[in-house]
């Protein structure tokens, strides 16, 4: 398989990829000649190969052409050559010879004309394995890689030359390359391509952040000689509306948001709010929907609450206790208050007036958090419309209508207290005649009474209410010998007082009558 | 321009010797070893040994050896193949051809235009 | 004694065509097998090295494959000065010939 060559190697010369003849020096001209090959991968390339192990003192030169130095400081010479093994070679022992010579000349002019001794010796190449004829079926197995390193170069190029002292060998492949740190992306910071110091010395880069990003703390990296990036310090973190995906800041997508700079990705929009652009912030609420103005981006878009329900008023005097239910729809938060707007009323309820500043509420007027409140020191004998707020986070955010619910009422005096005493006149075996005195606080005129009744064996599953006009009533159609429970309780312009306790008395088992007794229970 | 110049036809009698020359030119004499080879008439080819120009050793293959000799003369670039005692069934071509060592293999690369020697009563 | 033994002994093929030798061994010679070509009345000339490598000078219609045993010399479009007598050659510790294939017009 073709192994690609390292991103952090630049070639100055490569024989494989050149078209055509090399045209390389050799001296003499019966020394190194150049042929038509194969690479380990069978692909067609010129090769030069010299074989002249019959001759004792064999010196044949192979220059290359002039190879330009470009920026580097450090180069490597990498050889793909095959060596024949002396041994499968008839004829030819104590001749032949298995290493051969590279050089090296620096130059700036490309015209100069192939002198030995300006050569400098890079090193002397021996196969790591040489091949016998038997090996010859498989020519995978024959390249051999051997790879050197000069430096420090100064002068604008050189020229490379191999001398050949009598083996039999063939240059494959000549890639005279230098290393350099190549453009990489490391914490989305920019480093450019660098080339390092021949030195042991480190080279330090400064990176720029990647389009959309800002520096967290300053990107830098070190070069090392061998073109390997080492030691990344600080990084880069994507703006608010970018997330980090692979080596680029990457816009949100429309339905996605990012708040902040930082490493964070971004989140889809919160229920009821969309983008439909590349690159949010944050995301825009839907029509009706609203964020409060501290709410966070991450926070779904709500709703004022619907109306409060179920409000029921309990008039005491001139007090009255409000209570309600939650609304149905809180619109999607929490934070629900609730606010008591109260009007005083003529008789035509739509001639209303604020209600004075004496009218207390308790525990407050404004800002409830739980769903009763107690209104007190209102006028007598007057009408009140109390409408009841609910609120949100949002609701100042939104148009009119408000969300309420409201409750008309009538205040009065107190209603009268209980009676105290029932007393039995007459009993028979069908009836029953009772009498009692006026509440000691009757709070007003005694529009009547409420006489409630019932067996005293049945346990108040089943009774009777009837009216009397008077302080005595007689109730007839009872079962004879039976005991009865009664009650009896006033009514006035503001309403019924509460019960008396409860009086047990019974029915004649014949038809005689019994007269003037109390009850007690 | 390399080239092996060969000598032209001998006609010998049974038993005589004849020594067939074979001129090098156009290249080092002595860095390529010389191979010789046999063509019967109307037959195939048979190699019959080569000589290491550099050392002067030869290498006869079965049935070319005793009768058979070769030899150099490098101040002329010379090689030399005699036979002795020769037959008739030694009437045939005689080659002479430069050995070429390769990398990937060896082959015989450059050949004269190869002597006939014919042995006749 | 590593013999080779050529086949077919005569290949009879028309300008144009496809040629294809074939030359086996008695044990294997791995790739050290070249291929020569002689014309009637000349010397042999060098085709093929190395079992498959072409001299300077060689048409590149002449190929060679084959490592071990089996050996094959292709022409791929024979040409008129193509017809001539084709001989493989090993090199072991004694160089051989094989018989030749003999490649005449159809």
């Known amino acids: 398989e073709l192994s690609p060559q390292p991103s952090n190697e630049v070639n100055l010369l490569d024989s494989k990829t050149i078209q055509g003849e090399l045209g390389w020096i050799s001296y003499p001209s019966h020394g190194w000649e150049e042929i038509s090959g194969v690479d380990e991968h069978y692909t067609p390339i010129r090769t030069y190969q010299v074989c002249n192990v019959m001759d004792h003192s064999q010196n044949n030169w192979l220059r290359t052409n002039w190879v330009p130095r470009n920026s580097a400081q450090k180069i490597y010479v990498e050889l793909k050559f095959t060596l024949r093994d002396c041994n499968s070679i008839p004829l030819v022992l104590g001749t032949c010879k298995e290493t051969f010579n590279l050089y090296y000349m620096e130059s700036d002019d490309h015209g100069v004309k192939f002198r030995e001794h300006q050569f400098t010796k890079i090193d002397t190449i021996a196969a790591d394995e040489s091949f016998t004829q038997m090996d010859l079926g498989d020519r995978i197995l024959k390249l051999n890689t051997e790879i050197r390193e000069v430096g420090p170069v100064n002068k604008k190029g050189f020229y490379l030359a191999f001398q050949d002292v009598g083996a039999c060998v063939a240059l494959v492949s000549v890639r005279v390359y230098f290393k350099k740190c190549p453009f990489t992306v490391k914490n989305l910071a920019m480093f450019p391509d660098t080339v390092p110091m021949d030195s042991q010395s480190l080279v330090e880069v400064r990176g720029s952040c990647v389009n959309n990003s800002k520096e967290e703390d300053p990107p830098r990296m070190y070069c090392s000689t061998e073109g390997e990036w080492l030691v990344p310090i600080g990084k880069c973190t994507c703006n608010a509306g970018y997330e980090e995906r692979g080596f680029i800041c990457q816009a949100c997508r429309p339905g996605f948001y990012k708040a902040s700079d930082g490493a964070a990705k971004c989140a889809k929009c919160p229920p009821h709010s969309s983008t439909q652009e590349d690159g949010s912030m944050n995301c825009r609420c839907e029509n009706n929907y609203f964020r409060a103005e501290k709410d966070p981006p991450s926070m779904a878009c709500a709703r004022p609450p619907s109306a409060p329900r179920n409000v029921i008023s309990n008039i005491n005097e001139t007090s009255v206790i409000l209570d309600w239910s939650w609304p149905l729809d809180t619109g999607g938060r929490k934070d629900i208050t609730f606010n008591i707007i109260c009007k005083k009323c003529g008789w035509n309820v739509r001639q209303c007036e604020p209600c004075s500043p004496n009218v207390r509420f308790l525990p407050r007027q404004l800002g409830l958090t739980n769903t009763t409140v107690t209104v007190t020191d209102l006028l007598a004998h007057t009408n009140y419309t109390f409408e009841i707020d609910a609120v949100n986070g949002v609701s100042e955010l939104s148009s009119p209508p408000r969300q309420y619910a409201a409750v008309s009422i009538t205040t009065n005096q107190a209603a009268p207290s209980p009676v105290m005493t029932i007393k039995k006149d007459r009993t028979s075996r069908n009836s029953i005649s009772l009498s009692w005195q006026e509440p000691e606080h009757p709070n007003g005129i005694i529009l009547d009474y409420e006489v409630k009744y019932y067996q005293k064996q049945e346990q108040e599953t089943s009774y009777t209410i009837l009216r009397a006009r008077g302080t005595n009533v007689t109730i007839s159609s009872l079962k004879p010998d039976t005991t009865y429970v009664f009650q009896i309780r006033a009514r006035t312009a503001a309403g019924y007082g509460t019960n008396s306790r409860k009086f047990e008395f019974e029915t004649s088992p014949d038809s005689f009558s019994i007269s003037g007794e109390n009850s007690h229970v | 321009q390399v080239q092996l110049l060969q000598s032209g036809a001998e006609v010998k009698k049974p038993g005589a010797s004849v020594k067939v020359p074979c001129k090098a030119s156009?290249?080092?004499?002595?860095?390529?070893?010389m191979s010789w080879v046999r063509q019967a008439p109307g037959q195939g080819l048979e190699w019959m040994g080569w000589?290491?120009?550099?050392?002067?050793?030869?290498t006869y293959a079965q049935g070319f050896t005793g009768r058979f000799v070769f030899s150099l003369d490098t101040s002329v670039s010379t090689a030399y193949l005699q036979i002795s005692s020769l037959k008739a069934e030694d009437t045939a071509v005689y080659y002479c051809?430069?050995?070429?060592?390769?990398?990937?293999?060896?082959?015989?690369?450059?050949w004269g235009q190869g002597t006939l020697v014919t042995v006749s009563s | 004694e590593i013999v080779l033994t050529q086949s077919p002994a005569t290949l009879s093929v028309s300008p144009g065509e496809r040629a294809t030798l074939s030359c086996r061994a008695s044990q294997s010679v791995s790739s050290n097998l070249p291929w020569y070509q002689q014309k009637p009345g000349q010397a042999p000339r060098l085709l093929i090295y190395g079992a498959s490598t072409r001299p300077t000078g060689i048409p590149d219609r002449f190929s060679a494959s084959g490592s071990g045993t089996d050996f094959t010399l292709t022409i791929s479009r024979v040409e008129p000065e193509d017809f001539a007598v084709y001989y493989c050659q090993q090199y072991g510790p004694s160089w051989t010939f094989g018989q030749g294939t003999k490649v005449e017009i159809k």
């Open positions: 051809a430069r050995v070429r060592f390769t990398v990937y293999g060896d082959g015989m690369d450059v």
């Open positions: 156009g290249y080092t004499f002595t860095s390529r070893a």
């Open positions: 000589i290491n120009t550099n050392t002067g050793n030869p």
